[in-house]
């Protein structure tokens, strides 16, 4: 808390400029009008104030706006944003994406701070959903943003926002997160033609069910092995040898190198050896010829 002292003669600030960096903390408090500061916030960022001086400027704004700053001030906070507490930010009503971008820029390249997390939370709640433009902005600043959200939070992402998602934004998502995102992507891209659709849906396929993989196998998509290895094991197991061959196209040869790894390993164990032999890859471990396969899970479901 800065003591209230009278401003020395001739030191009253007429505008926010470089001369203020020579003011002591008490002089800033006494000689800078809070309303002037609020209208000229855009200048503060260009002036090399010390952290202590920024504390005084924040204090002046807090006194002027005890209920929270207006957006016109928030948008131009610049480095003063780093001085804000989550409690300060909870008082704000940020509706403009430009304001959000301006404040994210201040924190760029650094881990998400409590201030930024609070700001994003306030912004998204204010909009009612994580819309496309917001998601676009957030993933530009924080590439791992989507994959750091819980499945419950991801379920509030509307399908239209999926257009903003780049493959690299999903690189580190786990299967549970992809289970939530895949149906949204399927809905978002449903009107695209075969090859274009596959390019868009490919990074979401870790959440795809068996029936969708079967459908893709009829479309000459030539899925690469890296994508195949990320598919849900339970979705791959019911696929026939012919379906996997169609799904992978020329990449089917890559199965040999992955035969000891999931989901390939588990899939091989479910196939007839005769069928596997038709691939000519030397895959071993299938069901020997003449053996009867009982699906006990189906039997349990019927009883």
């Amino acid at each position: 808390e800065v003591e209230k002292t009278a401003c020395p003669s001739g030191k009253k600030a007429r505008e926010i400029d470089e001369s203020l960096i020579f003011y002591k903390k008490w002089e800033l408090e006494a000689c800078v009008d809070a309303a002037l500061l609020a209208t000229q916030m855009d200048r503060v960022n260009a002036i090399p104030f010390t952290y202590e001086q920024l504390d005084v400027l924040k204090h002046k704004l807090d006194e002027l706006y005890p209920q929270g700053y207006p957006e016109s001030v928030i948008q131009h906070l610049g480095y003063l944003f780093l001085k804000m507490s989550p409690e300060d930010i909870r008082k704000w009503n940020v509706t403009s994406l430009e304001t959000l971008k301006a404040l994210l820029e201040v924190n760029k390249g650094h881990e998400m701070s409590p201030q930024v997390a609070t700001l994003i939370d306030r912004f998204v709640k204010g909009r009612g959903q994580l819309d496309k433009d917001t998601l676009d902005t957030l993933t530009a600043f924080y590439p791992g943003y989507l994959c750091s959200l819980s499945p419950e939070e991801l379920s509030s992402v509307p399908p239209s926002s999926i257009w903003a998602v780049r493959p690299q934004d999903l690189d580190t998502c786990d299967p549970r997160q992809l289970d939530v995102l895949y149906p949204k992507a399927r809905l978002a891209f449903q009107n695209m033609n075969g090859s274009e659709y596959f390019v868009k849906i490919q990074s979401f396929l870790g959440g795809a069910p068996t029936e969708d993989l079967k459908a893709l196998s009829q479309q000459n998509v030539s899925m690469d092995l890296a994508t195949f290895m990320k598919l849900r094991t339970d979705a791959v197991l019911p696929l026939t040898v012919a379906e996997v061959q169609k799904l992978l196209g020329p990449h089917v040869e890559g199965l040999k190198a992955e035969e000891r790894h999931r989901p390939v390993r588990d899939w091989i164990l479910r196939q007839r050896q005769d069928d596997l032999d038709t691939l000519g890859l030397g895959l071993q471990g299938g069901i020997p010829n003449g053996y009867l396969v009982l699906d006990l899970s189906m039997q349990e479901a019927l009883s």
């Epitope: 881990e111 998400m112 997390a117 959200l149 819980s150 499945p151 419950e152």
Partner: nanobody, 116 residues
Framework: EVQVVESGGGLVQPGGSLRLSCGVS????????MRWYRQTPGNQREWVAS????????GYADSVKGRFIISRDSAKNMMSLQMNSLKSEDTAVYYC?????????WGQGTQVTVSS
């Protein structure tokens, strides 16, 4: 600088239990997902389980569902994996993974060997 350290690995008999811990030092903040992955002797890294920042909801790979339990203490930046009814196929190096909006941090791993 964020550091992730796993502990608790070891040799255990089939059917036995083990508890792995993961500690995170440095500032990573509230919004993060913590995961366990494992790398088998055949060199495949596979996802095991996740615990999410919001509400502490969890997710498990089918191969460990019902046997493993993931939990976290956000105040201490700690996560653990309680592994029960261990099988020989659970033998692997177990890695802790911390996903923030900006980065992914990995630990060095802890070896779990299930053998009689």
């Amino acid at each position: 600088e964020v550091q992730v350290v796993e502990s608790g690995g070891g040799l255990v008999q089939p059917g036995g239990s083990l508890r792995l811990s993961c500690g995170v030092s440095g500032s990573i903040l509230a919004l993060n997902t913590m995961r366990w992955y494992r790398q088998t002797p055949g060199n495949q890294r596979e996802w095991v389980a996740s615990i999410y920042s919001s509400g502490g909801s969890t997710g498990y790979a089918d191969s460990v569902k019902g046997r493993f339990i993931i939990s976290r203490d956000s105040a201490k930046n700690m996560m653990s994996l309680q592994m029960n009814s261990l099988k020989s196929e659970d033998t692997a190096v177990y890695y802790c993974n911390v996903q923030t909006p900006l980065n992914v941090y990995w630990g060095q791993g802890t070896q779990v060997t299930v053998s009689s």
